[in-house]
């Protein structure tokens, strides 16, 4: 808490300008009117205030707006945003994309801080949903943003927002997140033709069920091995050798290099060896010829 002292004669600030960098902390407190500061916040960023001086300016705004800053002030906080705590930010109502961009710009190049996470939360609540424009903006600053959300949070993403998602935005998503995103992507891209659809849906296929993979195998999509390796194991296991061959097309040869890794390893264990031999890749570990295959999961379901 800065002590209240009278402003020395002739030092009362008429506007926010560079002369203020020579003011001591107590002089800033005494001589800068909080309302003036609020209306000229956009100038603060251009002035090389010390961290201690910024603390004083923040204190003045806190006194003026104990219930939380108005968005017209928030938009122009600039580096003063770095002084805000998540508790401060929780009091804000942020709805403008330009406000969000301006504050994300301040934090650019750094990891997502608790302040930024809280800001994004306030923004999404203020707008009513995580819309396409928001997603565009957030993934531009934080490519991994989408994958930082819980499946519950992702469930509120409207399918229309999926158009904003780039493949690299999904790099760190786990299967639970892709399980939520895949049906939305399927809905978003449903009116596209076969090849265009596959290009768009490819990044989301880690959430695809078996029946969708079977359908894709009929469409000459030539899935690459990197995508295949990210598929859900439980979705891959029921696929026949013929279906996997059609799904991968010329990339089927890559199975040999991945035969020790999931889901390829587990899939091989479920196939008849003579079916695997038809691929001519030397894949080993299938069910020997003459063995009977019991589907225990079906048996459990019946009992």
């Amino acid at each position: 808490e800065v002590e209240k002292t009278a402003c020395p004669s002739g030092k009362k600030a008429r506007e926010i300008d560079e002369s203020l960098i020579f003011y001591k902390k107590w002089e800033l407190e005494a001589c800068v009117d909080a309302a003036l500061l609020a209306t000229q916040m956009d100038r603060v960023n251009a002035i090389p205030f010390t961290y201690e001086q910024l603390d004083v300016l923040k204190h003045k705004l806190d006194e003026l707006y104990p219930q939380g800053y108005p968005e017209s002030v928030i938009q122009h906080l600039g580096y003063l945003f770095l002084k805000m705590s998540p508790e401060d930010i929780r009091k804000w109502n942020v709805t403008s994309l330009e406000t969000l961009k301006a504050l994300l710009e301040v934090n650019k190049g750094h990891e997502m801080s608790p302040q930024v996470a809280t800001l994004i939360d306030r923004f999404v609540k203020g707008r009513g949903q995580l819309d396409k424009d928001t997603l565009d903006t957030l993934t531009a600053f934080y490519p991994g943003y989408l994958c930082s959300l819980s499946p519950e949070e992702l469930s509120s993403v409207p399918p229309s927002s999926i158009w904003a998602v780039r493949p690299q935005d999904l790099d760190t998503c786990d299967p639970r997140q892709l399980d939520v995103l895949y049906p939305k992507a399927r809905l978003a891209f449903q009116n596209m033709n076969g090849s265009e659809y596959f290009v768009k849906i490819q990044s989301f296929l880690g959430g695809a069920p078996t029946e969708d993979l079977k359908a894709l195998s009929q469409q000459n999509v030539s899935m690459d091995l990197a995508t295949f390796m990210k598929l859900r194991t439980d979705a891959v296991l029921p696929l026949t050798v013929a279906e996997v061959q059609k799904l991968l097309g010329p990339h089927v040869e890559g199975l040999k290099a991945e035969e020790r890794h999931r889901p390829v390893r587990d899939w091989i264990l479920r196939q008849r060896q003579d079916d695997l031999d038809t691929l001519g890749l030397g894949l080993q570990g299938g069910i020997p010829n003459g063995y009977l295959v019991l589907d225990l999961s079906m048996q459990e379901a019946l009992s």
């Epitope: 017209s72 709805t95 994309l97 330009e98 424009d133 565009d136």
Partner: antibody
Amino acid sequence: QEQLVESGGGLVQPGASLTLTCTASGIDFSRYYMCWVRQAPGKGLEGIACIYIGGSGSTYYASWAKGRFTISKASSTTVTLQMTSLTAADTATYFCARGTNLNYIFRLWGPGTLVTVSS
Amino acid sequence: DVVMTQTPSPVSAAVGGTVTIKCQASQSINNGLAWYQQKPGQPPRLLIYSASNLESGVPSRFKGSGSGTEFTLTISDLECDDAATYYCQCIWDGNSYVNAFGGGTEVVVK
């Protein structure tokens, strides 16, 4: 007195290009959205494009307007809308409107300029 | 893009009566809605912003309500001068909202 005035409208041939200008007077232009909205005869309002004056300078377009319409800041008091490959469906009164620094609340509108596309 | 749907159109009522115009958003927009009045040959005039805030100079007979996806404009004590077309609009900034006007509702005063 705050005022917006559109100019550049008129009769043009199908396939032609046209640039409309919005001139502001009595306005601090530095912190506002400036947008173009059109209205075909007897029809409703249709947003075209917006530009954020100051700050990021971001431009935003309606999905139908991307590629054929370009909004830009020509000077400290003027915003333009370039329109290409015009068709009869582009016949409308074109308004410029000023939003706030935060959103598309349009408190100030120009009187509009009529663009007629016909051969 | 967000789609704004207005109903009904036209709507008519007698002088002194009340009319209610509804506006529905295709997705939740919280309180991000404005209402405009437009008369022939004139640009629109802002009446209500942020769903329920009355613009300066607009009579209190105009009342906005709603949040999320459902919004209402109510005009009470109807006057002849209220005969016009009324538009709702999502006010959020961004590409998705540039063209976020409702189709308009014509109010006829008898």
